[in-house]
Interface confidence: low
């Protein structure tokens, strides 16, 4: 069938269009093009006789048309009037006629738009600004950009006049941004230059810095005032109500007690005409003496003794302050202050209470510090640790064990094997061990000052064969993207190869998987939910190879961003609203709903029967995983429309 294709269909003024003929019949006598949807001699553009290859212009010929032997028609330098239908009339050699109609549309190339504004210097929280995109153009679409982003959703932003006008109600300083408008039609899109909105605001309540209000006699007073304001504020200072100077900073050298009083900073914005003030009360004090600390016990025993630290000298009408490790006193039931704060008592001291301690005398708020004092807390011994941590040894090697226990003063050590005393040293050495050296090895640590002793027992097995290994983990329930997990293959044995499998496969290559400690420890960094697999370790030596039982990693994750279903956001009045929320999480999360910020039920499904426009709003599903301590949420806007609701009435007049 004879058809006409317009290339392009939407044509810009001044450009050209090709009316391309498809399925042109064979054995033609000639053809003619007509403007319009039918053959009309008065509207003939051009005719073409194939035999003579002669083209004859018709009444509608404009001089811009070119006809091709394949019957296609090229129209150049397109004008608006060219819009419409074009009919090709084909006369076959048998004089049978055939017709086909095509069409195209003509649009103007849009000019570069510009933005006009009804208010070049709007005042915050008072004025509105209406931006209008110029010029007004028919068949054009208007778009707006703020800081090169599409318009944010805001009740203070309103588009009108076919989107040609953007109104900002009650402008704020945050509306200071780059605004652009864009015009579009099917053949062009143009964007305006940016217009920067200059919002006048402030001054806000000024802040006076520094914040401290107490000074020592002889210091310099240097106060600075700042108030957020556009244009920048002008500042004035008043002392006890008397004007001082119109500067942002107030400097008084070598102050005395007489400089105590109320200091007022006034900020003024000449454009908004607003004034704001802030008052600070400055107190200047005389200097107190330097304090020092005395102690009732210079060598207290951990968990037994109390220590009383006293700040000297005793001065009437003075406030005493204390610092530990250069910080104010922590809240602790073991720390007690006397009524006058002069004595600090440490009940049942621990090794962490060594300090340093400082006290301060405060004559009002001018503070002098004492020299630091450090406590010598006697402690320990703690349970000794025996190293290395091997429990299996192969016959014929040397056994070398070392013992250490935290202690003040340092501990004295003794070794026992199967309860029999061996030697009073920190290290035990036995060469060329045999199976007979298997047994219980005990290290005893003794603190001569406290008289306390502690022991640790280690079972040593001298054997060539290794036992079935087991996997120990430093974290049984790791949190996704936060925790690392270290799997260790037990026991620790000399001259042993350690192997690992995940889900029955050898370890994949991954930067998050790391083998260490002679491959005995497998660490998974930043675990993910995909790491919840079966882990197996194997040990191998010259005479044995064994595999552990699998350990499955239980990774806690989520909750992920929930999904509310169904996805619909528009409902008709009278329908039932049945929203279901789902979030991937381990363990399963707790669900709760909020409608317009108001808490609803703690269920996964929210059901509201027979909704009305009053049910319009934001529906938020909150998910919480108590195990990971993480929360997530998603907000969905639901619109309930009365049948045929008027958008023109939803927002205003």
């Amino acid at each position: 069938k004879l058809t006409i294709e317009s290339t392009p269909f939407n044509v810009a003024e001044g450009k050209e269009v090709l009316l391309l003929v498809h399925n042109l019949p064979q054995h033609l006598f000639g053809y003619s093009w007509y403007k319009g949807e039918r053959v009309d001699g008065n509207r003939q553009i051009i005719g073409y006789v194939i035999g003579t290859q002669q083209a004859t212009p018709g009444p509608a010929y404009s001089g811009r048309e070119i006809i091709y032997p394949n019957a296609s028609l090229l129209i150049q330098n397109i004008i608006q009037n060219d819009t419409g239908f074009y009919t090709l009339h084909v006369i076959k050699s048998d004089l049978v006629n055939e017709e086909a109609t095509g069409q195209f549309r003509v649009y103007p190339e849009l000019p570069k738009p510009s933005i006009s504004s009804n208010n070049s210097k709007p005042v915050e929280d008072k004025d509105a600004v209406a931006f209008t995109c110029e010029p007004e153009t028919q068949d054009a679409t208007y778009l707006w950009w703020v800081n090169n982003q599409s318009l944010p959703v805001s009740p203070r932003l309103q588009l009108s006049n076919g989107n040609r006008t953007l109104t900002l109600f009650n402008v704020t300083r945050n509306d200071t941004a780059s605004y652009k408008c864009e015009t579009q039609n099917p053949v062009s899109a143009r964007r305006s230059d940016s217009v920067i909105l200059n919002v006048l605001y402030g001054p806000d309540a000024p802040t006076i810095s520094p914040l401290n209000t107490s000074y020592r006699s002889g210091e310099n007073l240097n106060l600075s005032c700042h108030a957020a304001s556009n244009p920048p504020a002008q500042y004035s200072w008043f002392v006890n109500g008397t004007f001082q100077q119109s500067t942002q900073e107030l400097f008084i050298p070598n102050i005395t007690v007489n400089n105590s009083g109320s200091y007022t900073c006034q900020a003024h914005n000449s454009d908004t005409g607003l004034n704001r003030t802030t008052v600070t009360t400055i107190t200047v004090y005389a200097e107190p003496p330097k304090p020092f600390i005395t102690s009732n016990n210079s060598n207290p025993v951990e968990d037994e003794d109390a220590v009383a630290l006293t700040c000297e000298p005793e001065i009437q009408n003075t406030t005493y302050l204390w610092w530990v490790n250069n910080q104010s006193l922590p809240v602790s039931p073991r720390l007690q202050l006397s009524n006058d704060n002069r004595t600090l008592t440490l009940l049942s001291v621990t090794r962490n209470d060594v300090g340093p301690y400082e006290c301060g005398i405060q004559n009002e708020l001018s503070v002098d510090h004492s020299d630091p004092v450090i406590l010598n807390v006697l402690y320990g011994p703690d349970d000794p640790t025996i190293s290395p941590s091997y429990t299996y040894y192969r016959p014929g090697v040397n056994l070398s064990l070392s013992c250490h226990a935290a202690s003040n003063p340092p501990a004295q050590y003794s070794w026992l094997i199967d309860g029999n005393i061996q030697q009073h040293t920190q290290e035990l050495f036995i060469s060329n061990i045999t199976e007979k050296n298997s047994g219980l090895y005990t290290c005893q640590a003794n603190n001569s000052a406290s008289g306390h002793s502690r022991t640790t027992v280690k079972t040593i097995t001298v054997s060539a064969e290794l036992p079935k290994p087991s996997i120990s983990s430093n974290n049984s329930k790791p949190v996704e993207d936060k925790d690392a997990v270290a799997f260790t293959c037990e026991p620790e044995a000399q001259n042993t190869t350690y192997l690992w499998w995940v889900n029955g496969q050898s370890l994949p290559v991954s930067p998050r998987l790391q083998l260490s400690n002679g491959n005995r420890t497998l660490t998974l960094f930043n675990v993910t939910r995909n790491d919840a697999r079966a882990y197996v370790c194997g040990i191998q030596n010259s005479v044995s190879a064994n595999r552990s039982d699998p350990v499955t990693l239980d990774v806690l994750y989520g909750p992920d961003t929930p999904i509310i279903s169904p996805p619909d956001s528009s409902y008709l009045s009278g329908a039932n609203l049945n929203l279901s929320c789902h979030s991937a999480s381990n363990p399963s999360p707790q669900y709760s709903w909020r409608i317009n910020g108001i808490p609803q039920q703690h269920t996964q499904v929210l059901f509201i029967a027979k909704i009305t426009p009053n049910n319009n709003g934001t529906y938020a599903c909150f998910v919480s995983n108590l195990a990971t301590g993480r929360n997530n949420s998603i907000v969905k806007s639901i619109t309930v429309s009365a049948s045929g609701t008027s958008p023109g009435l939803s927002a205003g007049a």
Epitope: A130, P613, N614, L649, G652, A653
Partner: antibody
Framework: EVQLQQSGPGLVRPSQTLSLTCTAS????????MHWVRQPPGRGLEWIGW????????EYAPKFRGRVTMLADTSKNQFSLRLSSVTAADTAVYYC?????????????WGQGTLVTVSS | DIQMTQSPSSLSASVGDRVTITCSAS?????MHWYQQKPGKAPKLLIY???NLASGVPSRFSGSGSGTDYTFTISSLQPEDIATYYC?????????FGQGTKLEIK
């Protein structure tokens, strides 16, 4: 300048049909929702309904459903109200009304009102 | 339908007085709108969306409220303010008006 000019008879016989027309100038009715409101003598305002001239959609107050018809002719930039089977209780001043947004300003325009008396 | 109850139904005040009219809706509405109507004239919008002043309306008129309870205030009554004032809700169809408050000068 935006204007709404109402026309129609001031007297209608009981059981007949009240018919009023509102002709708009200064704006295109196609871009707005056009309302009808009435006010019985010495009483308050009563909303009858609206029409969206662009597509003919209507919303009527339940009280008038079954009796009211609103039509629009965008080529003439006018819209009409027809209220059938009228009684003396339908005696009122009838207003046509449009709400237009110009920038951030809410512009509210009303016809001059037509007092329709239902009487034999 | 949402019923709108205006009070008082009429009030008399002196020039310069502060005048307050309240409107109570039978169920919660998003906004309240306020109209002024002078005898023989069409209503004129004064306040839209609870608190916004319509174009050309003097700043002595104001509105406030939320939910079901709304207030319309004239801060300093002027002789030309003599009229009947109506509240209107547009949250739910049918749109409904209050019964009106007739304001007179003492």
């Amino acid at each position: 300048e935006v204007q709404l000019q109402q026309s129609g008879p001031g007297l209608v016989r009981p059981s007949q049909t009240l018919s009023l027309t509102c002709t708009a100038s200064g704006f295109n009715i196609k871009d707005n929702y056009m309302h009808w409101v009435r006010q019985p003598p010495g009483r308050g305002l009563e909303w009858i309904g609206w029409i969206d001239p662009e597509n003919g959609d209507t919303e009527y107050a339940p009280k008038f459903r079954g009796r009211v018809t609103m039509l629009a002719d965008t080529s003439k930039n006018q819209f009409s109200l027809r209220l059938s089977s009228v009684t003396a209780a339908d005696t009122a001043v009838y207003y046509c009304h449009v709400l237009i947004y110009a920038g951030y300003l809410a512009m509210d325009y009303w016809g001059q009102g037509t007092l329709v008396t239902v009487s034999s | 339908d949402i019923q709108m109850t205006q009070s008082p139904s009429s009030l008399s005040a002196s020039v310069g007085d502060r005048v307050t009219i309240t409107c109570s809706a039978s169920s919660s509405v998003t906004y309240m709108h306020w109209y002024q109507q002078k005898p023989g004239k069409a209503p004129k919008l004064l306040i839209y969306s609870t608190s916004n002043l319509a174009s050309g309306v003097p700043s002595r008129f104001s509105g406030s409220g939320s939910g079901t309870d709304y207030t319309f205030t004239i801060s300093s009554l002027q002789p030309e303010d003599i009229a009947t004032y109506y509240c209107q809700q547009r949250s739910t169809y049918p749109l409904t008006f209050g019964q009106g408050t007739k304001l007179e000068i003492k």
